[in-house]
């Protein structure tokens, strides 16, 4: 999906209002310095591409993020403010069904959500030069 035509300001507002709080809740009890940010993004469409991938695509050691509260609200925000997004997800979701059976918070998942927090922070500061 091409995130170029999304309403970035509304997605940012939704993130600041509630999605960010849900990410913090998920990470509660974890030190902010515990994980290094290894995933980066260069502009807002790129950030949303990476956020979408890390949130909804199962990875080795962490198959369960798509059922978390922050993921449900992320999906809602992208569907509402990115034209045509929800229609593109039909096939992708069917492929993920089997990977979502169990909901277990692993260290790998915590690391992945830490990466997500970094991507969202970058999304919110699009004018900053890439380090």
């Amino acid at each position: 999906y091409d995130f170029t035509n999304c309403d970035f300001e509304k997605i940012k507002a939704a993130y600041l209002s509630t999605i960010s709080k849900d990410l913090i809740t998920y990470m509660s009890g974890t030190k902010s310095t515990e994980f290094n940010n290894t995933v980066s993004c260069s502009n807002r469409p790129h950030c949303l591409t990476e956020i979408q991938s890390l949130t909804f695509n199962p990875t080795a050691g962490c198959a369960s993020l798509a059922k978390e509260m922050f993921a449900m609200k992320t999906k809602a925000a992208l569907a509402i403010w990115c034209p045509g997004y929800s229609e593109t997800q039909i096939n992708a979701t069917q492929a993920m069904k089997k990977a979502r059976k169990s909901k277990v918070t692993t260290n790998k998942c915590l690391e992945q959500v830490s990466q997500l927090q970094g991507l969202w922070r970058r999304f919110n500061r699009p004018l900053l030069k890439q380090q």
Partner: antibody, heavy 122, light 108 residues
Framework: QVQLVQSGAEVKKPGASVKVSCKSS????????MNWVRQAPGQGLEWMGQ????????TYNGNFKGRVTMTRDTSTSTVYMELSSLRSEDTAVYYC???????????????WGQGTTVTVSS | EIVMTQSPATLSVSPGERATLSCSVS???????LHWYQQKPGQSPRPWIF???NLASGIPARFSGSGSGTEFTLTISSLQSEDFAVYYC?????????FGGGTKVEIK
């Protein structure tokens, strides 16, 4: 304007199933999660689960132990809630409720259907 | 499961008086995830307050909400006849979503 119109009242026998519909209009149906909430007579509100019409993704309340199934028909902008193995305690008003971001970008159930009364009696 | 406990179950108040409704949450949640709904007999619930303190569209300013963590409050500064109803708090912090048992505000 956003409207959620639910199917009519149902009377069922214990052990049977019921399927309630909720037809949406006035917004992009595929882009908003739809919740089902029930209310037993004189009681409070109980969340049953939700469905994302865009891809059929669902999240259910475990209290219903596999008895509830939510589906959607994008061609008619309608979501369905089916409850099986009915018992008398399932007698309630069943509501569909859209969830979305309000003007302050808080996420909540912003529009509700008129409710469908389901009576379970032998 | 997060348990929402509302008190009192029934609040008897005279028109013009102040009403304070409480919602206690079994584990701490973000204030952005606490909402209030109003329901009148024979009607569907209506969104009333979003994110602890933000009034839904068209809700009069005599209503206010406050709180954080595990304790939240809905206050009606001067009750009008149309305010007599049941008010429910609800959390959107974790699954399953849960509601409080409701507080019925009735005429004294």
């Amino acid at each position: 304007q956003v409207q959620l119109v639910q199917s009519g009242a149902e009377v069922k026998k214990p052990g049977a199933s019921v399927k309630v519909s909720c037809k949406s209009s006035g917004y992009a149906f595929s882009s908003y999660w739809m919740n089902w909430v029930r209310q037993a007579p004189g009681q409070g509100l109980e969340w049953m689960g939700q469905i994302f019409p865009g891809d059929g993704d669902t999240t259910y309340n475990g209290n219903f132990k596999g008895r509830v199934t939510m589906t959607r028909d994008t061609s008619t902008s309608t979501v369905y809630m089916e409850l099986s193995s009915l018992r008398s305690e399932d007698t309630a008003v069943y509501y569909c409720a859209r969830s979305g971001f309000d003007y302050g970008y808080f996420y909540a159930m912003d529009y509700w259907g008129q409710g469908t009364t389901v009576t379970v009696s032998s | 499961e997060i348990v929402m406990t509302q008190s009192p179950a029934t609040l008897s108040v005279s028109p013009g008086e102040r009403a304070t409704l409480s919602c206690s949450v079994s584990s701490s949640i973000s204030s952005s995830n606490l909402h209030w709904y109003q329901q009148k007999p024979g009607q569907s619930p209506r969104p009333w307050i979003f994110g602890t303190s933000n009034l839904a569209s068209g809700i009069p300013a005599r209503f206010s909400g406050s709180g954080s963590g595990t304790e939240f409050t809905l206050t009606i500064s001067s009750l009008q006849s149309e305010d007599f109803a049941v008010y429910y708090c609800q959390q959107w912090s974790s699954y399953p979503l849960t509601f409080g048992g409701g507080t019925k505000v009735e005429i004294k």
